[in-house]
């Protein structure tokens, strides 16, 4: 069974799937489409590199420019290093700027929603 | 066959509101934005603003913040959206337009609502 | 906003005649984020042309698209009376989405 194949099979059990199984799905080609994206749960996506998103969707990863501005693509996007966001080419903006620490203060975190910044 | 439906003219009066509805057959609903346009004589076409109706998230054109509420009902796959405190700049003709997910542009727009502000 | 300005805001051509119309972006546009709708009088806009080339299904072949960073165009190789419409370009390349003025093309 190819990527996609599987891919269909599991496609609607994927709403709640953890990190892990999307990292894991990440590595099986399966090209998952922005509708089933935007599906996932947003704890679950904030932890994904760029690389493993761009994995995840495969061809359709150029769709995350035009919900740039929707959860949990926002999120995510808020997530990331800008020059991470930018080797993908799509002009997604709103990343982590060069020079910036990203401290993982769950509490800050949970409290305003966004990562805590050091500037350089 | 793809549809969106909306609603005839309205006439309102000024400081008043309006709800139109667009509903939505022939697709999967949940797979696609809801958009809505504005286009009037003096603007042209302008953007309002766009729902997600999996997750009811918005987005808006500043322009239209606190003018444009967009709403959606799932189970009758149908979209709305309520214009507030109008006033003669609003005059225009309303459409709805699907915008499948990741993409940007409108594959299929809806009739078209004309909302005519006038006492 | 990125505004797209559109010209001619009204022309006319004869048939067989080649119609090109442009659209110019006040900033640079990736590509993929620029398509073109039609009009008719009277009635909903509908998608003609999107990621600047790609037709939209029902369009016929003499009709294409091209452009790059700020200037982009629609161009009828062979202009038929059915093509007679308004023509608007729209970006997606930044919010809010914006809109050209429109071409209002005419048969002569």
């Known amino acids: 069974m190819n990527g996609s194949e599987y891919f269909v099979k599991i496609q609607s059990f994927l709403g709640g799937a953890p990190t892990e199984d999307l990292k894991a799905l990440s590595q099986q080609n399966v090209s998952m489409d922005l509708a089933t994206f935007m599906k996932l749960r947003t704890d679950a996506v904030l932890p994904l590199t760029v690389a493993e998103v761009q994995k995840l969707l495969g061809p359709h990863v150029e769709g995350l420019k035009a919900e740039e501005r929707h959860r949990p693509v926002r999120d995510w996007i808020l997530r990331q290093r800008q020059d991470d966001l930018d080797t993908l080419g799509l002009g997604l903006q709103g990343g982590i700027p060069n020079g910036y620490l990203v401290l993982d203060l769950s509490m800050q975190e949970a409290l305003s929603g966004t990562p805590c910044l050091l500037g350089p | 066959e793809v549809q969106l439906q909306q609603s005839g003219p309205e006439l309102v009066k000024p400081g008043a509101s309006v709800k139109i509805p667009c509903k939505a057959s022939?697709?999967?609903?949940?797979?696609?934005?809801m958009d809505w346009v504005k286009q009037s004589h003096g603007k042209g076409l302008e953007w309002i603003g766009d729902?997600?109706?999996?997750?009811?998230?918005?987005i808006y054109n500043q322009k239209f913040n606190g003018k444009a509420t967009l709403t959606v009902d799932k189970s009758s796959s149908t979209a709305y959206m309520e214009l507030r405190s109008l006033t003669s700049e609003d005059t225009a003709v309303y459409y709805c337009s699907r915008r499948l997910i990741g993409t940007g542009y409108f594959d299929v727009w809806g009739t078209g609502t004309t909302v005519t502000v006038s006492s | 906003q990125i505004v797209l300005t559109q010209s001619p805001a009204i022309m006319s051509a004869s048939p067989g005649e080649k119609v090109t119309l442009t659209c110019s972006a006040s900033?640079?546009?990736?590509?993929?984020?620029l398509c073109w709708y039609r009009q008719k009088p009277g009635s909903s806009p509908e998608l003609w042309i999107y990621?600047?080339?790609n037709l939209a299904s029902g369009v016929p072949a003499r009709f294409s698209g091209s452009g790059s960073g700020t200037s982009y165009s629609l161009t009828i190789s062979s202009m038929e009376a059915e093509d007679a419409a308004s023509y608007f370009c729209h970006q997606w390349s930044n919010y809010p989405y914006t809109f050209g003025g429109g071409t209002k093309l005419g048969m002569k």
């Open positions: 900033s640079s546009v990736i590509s993929t984020y």
């Open positions: 022939g697709y999967t609903f949940t797979d696609y934005n």
């Open positions: 729902i997600n109706p999996n997750t009811d998230d918005t």
């Open positions: 990621s600047t080339s």
